[in-house]
């Protein structure tokens, strides 16, 4: 009788196997920043080191009574979820606990920073195997807490954080909003978002994925073999920390970018009912529930991509939105999306040596999102080719002219403010293979990449009749790298990628104006990596 | 997240010269003060002074010491609770909010963040 949460995240073929690093020892270490814990609990005894680190605020209230089992409750449960002998995700993993939350579950940003610095110092004094840091806590948005997470992540530490239990945008909380942490929302046994009283799991673009977080059985500090169930995004984050520990145990050299991409790629997709989230957050929130991925040896050199949404630009006329990939990832395409449809397109530019995806709001628009497609392409050499806007009535063509470079994405940016005079840009997969084609007043950007065995092709799907969205998916074995909306309705909201699906959105009011001849087309660029092959464009 | 969401960033209005001290007037404050948007979660009186990324170890200590010295001239006692060396350059200080203007004008200061609560989730 395995708890539901373990059954959910650990596929049947993993249930009995032990994860061991190549040399036979499990050297992954998980650092837990939480309450004090009961180290003598049978679930974690012998695998937990209770550090002498303690940085907590005083408990509130003059009559507060410190009861050890209550003080240890949250941390003990999470330690059990990560590495408990019976109810843990990564049963052999050694854990270090740092006390940053008091008996009431309260801590401070400064205490958390000192804790993170303690981990960094430990790492410098005694370098060890892979480190995972679990942050099952949240406070308001903190620039310094996010910066500290970024600095620690850049030393090779993998940070996993709770999205927060405020039924709110996770981007408003830290460390959940730090791009360098893996941020985890909570789902229940029915794979639905967790409700906690009047609140529930946080959501939005700062959440990387969801994991079990309702009625999770784990070690209870009430006795040394006791169990209890707890709920929250802390429990969800603990599951992902356990999964990451198991992944690193098998393959200690996996980087943060690889871990995140693999977690996303192998998660269970489209099981969450998105209607639970506010309407404006549904498109930004990942419909992903974590599962333990197979090792890279079993899955080969698959091309892995994820979608990164920018913050909302805001409604000012020249407002721009910027979406960034992680340092190790390649930005293979950039698109944009606006709920009002008033946008002036998107482009890729280099900022501080890194390619970023930008989107521009249009006059009267409520704001835009930039949508980056971030991929892991080993030994990639990517560049951007752009052509300024053509004169009225002429098309602008951009293709990848360097030898062995393939088109992975197109972006279009309109110089004109008047949305009615311009036509939508287009990709042409038949007449001009591997080209981005723009219409009136559009600057066109082609993202071109060379990597061993990288091959790409365009796949289009058009709908003439009324439709709020048009989708096209890349087939099995291919990965979506670029997604655009092609001419059709007078007003499109933009395009974005959801896993391997390219979604082109059309404005509601545009449906009525449309004649049957004007097809709205979703155009996907699908790529795959075949290490033995040469880079090529597939027609 | 790259942008600072629902977050309070305050540029404190500062006179060009304070108490006629030339060394302080020389440095115009470009640093910002930040605090949690949720008032109930704020911890006024405790501040994280974050220094520019390239700030050297000795400069961190000097900056903290300089703040203590200048505060003392004004009759304030401040307590440096922790110095950050390994993750970012900076220090944690317990002081009156009256001293924020002074602290923001110190050399090497990038921003100051008021401490705030975090909670078990």
């Amino acid at each position: 009788s395995i708890p539901w949460n373990l059954e959910r995240i650990i596929p049947a073929w993993h249930q009995t196997e032990e994860d061991r690093s190549p040399d036979g020892s499990s050297q992954v270490e998980v650092y837990l920043l939480d309450t004090s814990i009961q180290g003598a609990h049978r679930e974690i005894e012998g695998r937990v080191t209770i550090t002498d680190f303690n940085s907590v605020p005083e408990e509130d209230g003059t009559r507060f009574h410190r009861q050890a089992s209550k003080c240890d409750s949250h941390g003990t449960h999470l330690a059990g979820v990560v590495s408990g002998r019976d109810a843990g995700v990564a049963k052999g993993t050694s854990l270090h606990s740092l006390r940053v939350l008091n008996c009431q579950g309260k801590g401070t940003v400064s205490g958390t920073l000192i804790g993170l610095e303690f981990i960094r110092k430990s790492q410098l004094i005694q370098p060890s195997g892979p480190l995972v840091v679990l942050l099952p806590l949240a406070g308001g948005y903190s620039r310094i807490l996010n910066a500290a997470c970024r600095h620690l992540a850049r030393t090779g530490v993998v940070l996993v954080a709770a999205a927060g239990n405020f039924r709110d945008d996770a981007c408003l909380y830290s460390p959940a909003s730090a791009p360098e942490v893996i941020t985890v929302g909570a789902t229940n046994a029915q794979d639905q978002p967790v409700t906690l009283g009047t609140l529930g799991t946080n959501f939005g673009r700062c959440v990387d994925l969801f994991a079990p977080g309702k009625d999770i059985i784990g070690a209870s500090s009430d006795c040394s073999t006791c169990f209890m169930s707890q709920s929250g995004t802390s429990q969800a984050a603990a599951h992902v920390a356990g999964i990451v520990a198991r992944m690193l145990s098998r393959e200690p050299t996996l980087t943060l970018a690889e871990l995140r991409q693999r977690l996303i790629h192998f998660s269970t997709k489209d099981v969450i009912n998105m209607a639970w989230f506010p309407e404006d957050q549904q498109v930004l929130t990942p419909n992903l529930v974590a599962t333990l991925p197979p090792s890279t040896h079993e899955t080969g050199g698959q091309l892995l991509c994820r979608t990164v949404w920018s913050a909302h630009s805001g409604p000012t006329r020249t407002a721009t939105a910027t979406a960034r990939c992680a340092p190790e990832e390649e930005l293979l395409s950039c698109s944009s999306f606006s709920r009002s449809g008033r946008r002036r397109g998107d482009w890729i530019e280099a900022i501080g040596g890194q390619q970023v995806c930008k989107a521009l709001n249009a006059f009267g628009g409520e704001g835009v999102y930039a949508v980056a497609r971030c991929c892991l392409v080993p030994r990639a050499n990517c560049s951007i080719h752009n052509t300024p806007a053509a004169r009225a009535g002429l098309e602008t063509h951009v293709h990848c002219h360097q030898k062995d470079h393939v088109l992975t994405g197109c972006s279009f940016h309109w110089e004109v403010e008047d949305l009615s005079v311009r036509r939508q840009p287009a990709l042409r997969s038949r007449r001009q293979p591997g080209q981005c084609v723009g219409h009136q007043a559009a600057s066109v950007y082609a993202s071109c990449c060379h990597a061993p065995g990288l091959e790409c092709k365009i796949k289009e799907h058009g709908i003439s009749g009324p439709s709020e969205q048009v989708t096209v998916a890349c087939e099995a074995g291919w990965t979506l790298t670029g997604c655009n909306v092609l001419p059709g309705a007078s007003l499109t909201l933009g395009a974005y990628s959801v896993d391997n699906l390219c979604v082109a959105r059309v404005h509601d009011t545009a449906r009525a104006d449309r004649t049957s001849g004007e097809a709205t087309v979703a155009a996907a660029i699908c790529c795959r990596s075949r290490p033995s092959a040469k880079a090529s464009w597939v027609q | 997240q790259d942008e600072d969401g629902d977050y309070e960033e305050l540029m404190l209005a500062l006179p060009s010269q304070e108490d006629g001290l030339a060394d302080e007037a020389a440095h115009v404050a470009t640093a910002t003060f930040r605090r949690c948007s949720k008032e109930a979660w704020r911890l006024p009186g405790t501040y994280i002074v974050v220094l520019m990324e390239e700030t050297q170890r000795l400069q961190i200590e000097q900056t903290a010491h300089r703040l203590q010295t200048r505060a003392a001239r004004r009759g304030y006692v401040i307590k440096v609770l922790h110095i950050f060396y390994d993750l970012f350059p900076g220090f944690l200080v317990k002081m009156s909010s009256d001293l924020l203007g002074l602290a923001l004008k110190l050399p090497h200061v990038e921003y100051i963040e008021e401490d705030s609560f975090v909670f078990a989730q």
Partner: antibody, heavy 118, light 108 residues
């Protein structure tokens, strides 16, 4: 060889008291945790309480609070159970056992029969 | 409070037969469950600890399995000396020691 030997059982009048002893041998007594368990004729096992090896703290089954008192004398390697206000339903075989909390009750005494009857 | 339910209450078997006793916990207990054997007129004796580990000196015909809430004690081939009462036991917060009601294995 670890051994636990109970004594002090016998016939007691209702409302009376008695003190049971459990003498341990074969290991360092002061570092061990001990518990008392009883078994009424033809019935199952019922936990009474224990004494902690570290601080000598005691813990009791709610049912026995105020009725049972557990103590130990490390110099004599002996564990005690004081029972007060005895009634007919307290008739049982009383066992002492060594425990390691969260693990098991690995060594048991042979038991001593207490009969409460007028 | 955890409740341990043993079944069957009585098991009538012949020597050489296989005996299977189950113990169900009212809530999740991981693998932290013990089995004891009690022969008439004797004290209980630890048989299996942590659901599946045989205690010192216990013959290999005794085995334990299960985790979570459902546990099984199996005697692969009954010997005459195995006819006794068997108890399962777990730890809890209050009371900390909990026993099952017992299963009597008797000669058919």
């Amino acid at each position: 060889q670890v051994q636990l030997l109970e004594s002090g059982g016998g016939l007691v009048q209702p409302g009376g008291s008695l003190r049971l002893s459990c003498k341990a041998s074969g290991y360092t007594f002061s570092r061990q945790g001990f518990t008392w368990v009883r078994q009424a004729p033809g019935k199952g096992l019922e936990w009474i309480g224990w004494i902690d090896p570290g601080n000598g703290g005691t813990r009791y089954n709610e049912k026995f609070k105020g009725k049972a008192t557990i103590s130990r004398d490390n110099s004599k390697n002996t564990l005690y159970l004081q029972m007060n206000s005895l009634r007919a339903e307290d008739t049982a075989v009383y066992y002492c056992a060594r425990y390691r909390v969260g693990y098991s009750l690995d060594y048991w005494g042979q038991g001593t029969l207490v009969t409460v009857s007028s | 409070e955890i409740v341990l339910t043993q079944s069957p209450a009585t098991l009538s078997l012949s020597p050489g037969e296989r005996a299977t006793i189950t113990c169900r916990a009212s809530q999740y207990v991981g693998s932290y469950l013990n089995w004891y054997q009690q022969k008439p007129g004797q004290a209980p004796r630890l048989l299996i600890y942590d659901a599946s580990n045989r205690a010192t000196g216990i013959p290999a015909r005794f085995s334990g399995s299960g985790s979570g809430t459902d546990f099984t004690l199996t005697i692969s081939s009954l010997e005459p000396e195995d006819f006794a009462v068997y108890y399962c036991q777990v730890w809890d917060s209050s009371p900390p020691v909990v026993f099952g009601g017992g299963t009597k294995v008797e000669i058919k």
